[in-house]
Interface confidence: medium
Amino acid sequence: AELFLIASPSHPTEGSPVTLTCKMPFLQSSDAQFQFCFFRDTRALGPGWSSSPKLQIAAMWKEDTGSYWCEAQTMASKVLRSRRSQINVHRVPVADVSLETQPPGGQVMEGDRLVLICSVAMGTGDITFLWYKGAVGLNLQSKTQRSLTAEYEIPSVRESDAEQYYCVAENGYGPSPSGLVSITVRIPVSRPILMLRAPRAQAAVEDVLELHCEALRGSPPILYWFYHEDITLGSRSAPSGGGASFNLSLTEEHSGNYSCEANNGLGAQRSEAVTLNFTVPTGARSNHLTS
């Protein structure tokens, strides 16, 4: 009696199952008097000797490439051996690499968590994922795993993390890069500082007083509101960041507390109040303003 080993499929792709069947063309293999054993190179596979002429391998990998055969043993201990069958496990090269962000859109608040998710549409086996920062490619991290996606996490985003990023996937056939993804770090405004600028050391009535408000940190555009006591004087926008000014033609009623507020949609901050007082110097005929 002759024994044959049949692998189905005969050219498996990595990660896919394979069924090995020990065929006995001239005998009933279902007959309980036979025991079967499957081998790869010199090593027995699965449960060892079994009454089943089939062995199911759940997932084949590149390193499972090798020479396979089976043996059948009768009750009388006579062992039949099949010829060796070469099974080559096929690896699919990585293709269509993409980089996505969590949160989506690549906009993240300073201090929040950013995840860069590298994915491949195709590829089998151990895939090495590498993340790079900037078009020149500062290598941030690499991970090797048997999956089509991998993640790189920045737990607390800083302003310096605002950059272009890309990832590369490789499983032995050459690296495949993703496109560039731009990360924008959104920074809430810091507490603004209000400065008063007069044309001379002691401003007089009808002088123009400049109220200058500036938040030293914060993503543009920033909208500044100016207040006298709790009355809104007006607003100014700083589309590219920096400060903004509001001009006031002084009258005696302009004594009191001034403040400003900065708002960039990520939160509002109000400055400390600055007090203006009109003083009448002894022997002087005009009123003067001090702060």
Partner: antibody, heavy 117, light 112 residues
Framework: QVQLVQSGAELVKPGASVKVSCKAS????????MHWVKQAPGQGLEWIGR????????KYNEKFKSKATLTVDKSTSTAYMELSSLRSEDTAVYYC??????????WGQGTLVTVSS | DIVMTQSPDSLAVSLGERATINCKSS????????????LAWYQQKPGQPPKLLIY???TRESGVPDRFSGSGSGTDFTLTISSLQAEDVAVYYC????????FGQGTKVEIK
């Protein structure tokens, strides 16, 4: 431009070892797997093994498993192949080669290793 | 191992004529999952390392003259030099990378 520059020719005695180097430049070293190929005088090409410079993981042709050891030094973008217990049949030109799109797209100039007493 | 067999072992062709080299693999190099043939062709001149000409059986490497073309699928492949030039005198190798790489024995191309 991409360059793989190998160390010079070696004359070694039987039983000795030799370490061939392959310095890569012009590309990101850790991104491309490096393979090594043997060419005996007047003969064809024979694959020895490969190494992933990023992880240091290597795979060998069964025939060269006890003959060759592949390593890398990421800091200098250099791949190494050490050949041990040398015999006359190890006399050959040894090439390092980078793999891209499955194929070997850039090759070193080759290192001739001559084993002779 | 996958065995690669080239034919002929050597070939003499007149300048400007077509040269054809065949390569046969012991098992299919075409995979339905991505419809790619895992085969490359190389040119090697004396004293030089091999040079990649074709990959994925028919994709020409950048900088390679268009007189070089690759064709075939499954187990049978062909490298064609449409009009042989003096600088094409070399040994040509096919190589599979479906599994751990193996090369054909080489075909020497000379001028008749």
């Amino acid at each position: 431009q991409v360059q793989l520059v190998q160390s010079g020719a070696e004359l070694v005695k039987p039983g000795a070892s030799v370490k061939v180097s392959c310095k890569a430049s012009g590309y990101t070293f850790t991104r491309y797997w490096m393979h090594w190929v043997k060419q005996a005088p007047g003969q064809g090409l024979e694959w020895i093994g490969r190494i992933d410079p990023n992880s240091g993981g290597s795979k060998y042709n069964e025939k060269f498993k006890s003959k060759a050891t592949l390593t890398v030094d990421k800091s200098t973008s250099t791949a190494y192949m050490e050949l041990s217990s040398l015999r006359s049949e190890d006399t050959a030109v040894y090439y390092c080669t980078r793999v891209n799109s499955g194929a070997m797209d850039y090759w070193g100039q080759g290192t001739l290793v001559t084993v002779s007493s | 191992d996958i065995v690669m067999t080239q034919s002929p072992d050597s070939l003499a062709v007149s300048l400007g004529e077509r040269a054809t080299i065949n390569c046969k693999s012991s098992q299919s190099l075409l995979y339905s999952s991505n419809q790619k043939n895992y085969l490359a062709w190389y040119q090697q001149k004396p004293g030089q390392p091999p040079k990649l000409l074709i990959y994925w059986a028919s994709t020409r490497e950048s900088g390679v003259p268009d007189r070089f073309s690759g064709s075939g699928s499954g187990t049978d492949f062909t490298l064609t030099i449409s009009s042989l030039q003096a600088e094409d005198v070399a040994v040509y190798y096919c190589q599979q990378y479906s599994n751990y790489p193996t090369f054909g024995q080489g075909t020497k191309v000379e001028i008749k």
